[in-house]
């Protein structure tokens, strides 16, 4: 009940705590399991034990094995076990299973990824951060303290991260790594009244008589996928099909888009050789969903021609 | 949350013996020992022992090494303390109690409602 | 055994007011433990390793010292603070309480 796995790479520091608990004030023992032979607690041996920590500066294979840690409290003395395997460094870059810490997940909201038992070490910054073997690089990653803080996470992110760090035994250094998986879940879906973020209420556009000029209407819904959402133009409040006029055309199909996570869509009106008359009518972009209707109105004017001649 | 639910009562002629029960909840019980402590009318706290559910192992203060017996129920989350040979001055409340947690096991952070026992003729 | 002197054994004290309570210990220990124990009801645990509140419990209540002195504080005495406190200890067998101070309101 009292045991506990603990793995490390030869040529590594491994640091394993007693998993029976006590005050530090309390004398902690350490065996050798196999053979009943005392840890000496001397900081001059390559293992050696400390109050409740076990260290293995650095381990080697041969040091596989079952390890008993007994805390001598006032009452009782509490009996631990650490199992503790060291393995030989992967020359590829595969991390096995056997090497891997528990999976945590994170979705945009939270996407903190701690580095698994660096607590143990006297470690300073930086602490280093791979991915698939390759060195995190980019202003989306951050690594702050003993964790990775990832922005704008997105699917592509999952995958195992190793954490590599250095600690410092009596003025001697010794890496460590620890790798884990990290999962992207998707976060609750919502949705709410459409927000249209483009055009603005009442915009004017400047357009140019007889060249081409786009207007874009975008709106986002919520979160997640939309059951039923829609972005479209109206022109003098009416449907572009019904209009008549094959000069103005909506962009074929919606684009999707998730901007900071929630769902949005674009609908691009194009007006080809732009005309007088269009500079009288008034376009609507219309943004519909389950919620409701929201219509932001948007007029042309005409762009004055730069004046060259000084 | 933790609670630690005793017996009741109980009144016990000199000589006799009387077995207090406390049964745990909101924690697996034998993840921390369980100890128990006295208090007569009147007087301050007094430490009887512990034991380790768990293991079944015991301390006991020397005072009343001898006389107390202190047994564990992993089935039923219960601990037990009997306490033999009464005299009147076995007269107080008996409670059990359990350690803020196994980095401060020297602390009681819970404690059970507590147990009159009345020693008398 | 390692015996614990509480002081004083009684007092009394004005709301509002700052309240102090010593324990003495007859050999050095490593932690000092403080409980609150109202009429009737099981003691409470206040101060852990010295100096740390325990949860839940109201930031007037710290204690502090070293060795074999220490203290126990309430910054501003409440009415609900009337009750008796007792100081603990476990550095070695057994483990003691002190014998109590009884707190009371003027």
């Known amino acids: 009940k009292f045991s506990k796995q603990s793995w490390g790479l030869e040529n590594e520091a491994l640091i394993v705590r007693c998993p029976r608990q006590g005050k530090p004030s309390y004398t902690v023992d350490w065996y050798y399991s196999q053979t009943n032979k005392s840890i000496p607690t001397q900081e001059r041996n390559r293992v050696f034990a400390s109050g409740q920590l076990l260290k293995f500066l650095p381990a080697a294979v041969a040091d596989s094995g079952i390890y008993t840690c007994i805390v001598r409290s006032p009452t009782f003395n509490r009996t631990g076990y650490a199992n503790v395997t060291i393995y030989k460094k992967q020359s590829d870059c595969n991390v096995p299973d056997y090497l891997m810490y528990s999976t945590v997940s994170g979705s945009e909201k939270n996407s903190k990824i701690y580095c698994p038992t660096i607590d143990l070490y006297n470690w300073t910054a930086p602490l280093e951060w791979f991915k698939n073997c390759q060195a995190l690089q980019g202003s989306r990653y951050r690594a702050h303290k003993s964790f990775l803080v990832i922005d704008n996470v997105m699917t592509e992110d999952a995958g195992d991260y190793t954490c590599k760090f250095i600690h410092n035994e009596n003025g001697a250094n010794y890496s460590v790594t620890a790798t884990r998986s990290f999962t992207v879940k998707d976060e609750q879906g919502f949705s709410l009244f459409p927000v249209i973020g483009a055009p603005a209420q009442n915009e004017i556009k400047e357009v140019e008589i007889g060249k081409n000029a786009n207007l874009t209407c975008s709106a986002c819904f919520g979160k997640g996928t939309q059951f039923l959402a829609a972005v479209l133009w109206q022109l003098n409040g009416t449907k572009i099909t019904d209009f008549g006029e094959p000069r103005i055309q909506q962009e074929e199909g919606q684009n999707q888009s998730f901007s900071n996570g929630l769902a949005c869509l674009d609908m691009v009106l194009r007006i080809a050789d732009v005309k007088e008359e269009d500079l009288l009518l008034q376009y609507d972009c219309l943004a519909l969903n389950l919620h409701g209707l929201r219509r932001h109105t948007v007029r042309l004017s005409r762009k004055n021609p730069i004046d060259h001649h000084s | 949350q933790v609670q630690l639910v005793q017996s009741g009562a109980e009144v016990k002629k000199p000589g006799a013996s009387v077995k207090v029960s406390c049964k745990a909840s909101?924690?697996?019980?034998?993840?921390?020992?369980m100890y128990w402590v006295r208090q007569a009318p009147g007087q301050g706290l007094e430490w009887m022992g512990a034991?380790?559910?768990?293991?079944?192992?015991?301390a006991f203060n020397q005072k009343f090494k001898g006389r107390v017996t202190m047994t564990a129920d992993k089935s039923t989350s219960t601990a037990y303390m009997e306490l033999s040979s009464l005299r009147s001055e076995d007269t107080a409340v008996y409670y059990c109690?359990?350690?803020?947690?196994?980095?401060?096991?020297?602390?009681?952070?819970?404690w059970g409602q507590g147990t009159m026992v009345t020693v008398s003729s | 055994d390692i015996q614990m002197t509480q002081s004083p054994s009684s007092l009394s004290a004005s709301v509002g007011d700052r309240v102090t309570i010593t324990c003495s210990a007859s050999?050095?220990?490593?932690?000092m433990h403080w409980y609150q124990q109202k009429p009737g009801k099981a003691p409470k645990l206040l101060i852990y390793?010295?100096?740390k509140l325990a949860s839940g419990v109201p930031s007037r209540f710290s204690g502090s010292g070293s060795g074999t002195d220490f203290t126990f504080t309430i910054s501003s005495l409440q009415p609900e603070d009337i009750a008796t406190y007792y100081c603990?200890?476990?550095?070695?067998?057994?483990?003691?309480f002190g014998q109590g101070t009884k707190l009371e309101i003027k």
């Open positions: 909101g924690y697996t019980f034998t993840d921390s020992e």
């Open positions: 109690t359990r350690a803020f947690d196994n980095d401060n096991d020297d602390a009681f952070a819970y």
């Open positions: 034991i380790d559910p768990e293991t079944g192992d015991t």
């Open positions: 390793d010295t100096s």
């Open positions: 050999s050095s220990v490593n932690y």
């Open positions: 603990q200890q476990w550095s070695s067998n057994p483990l003691t």
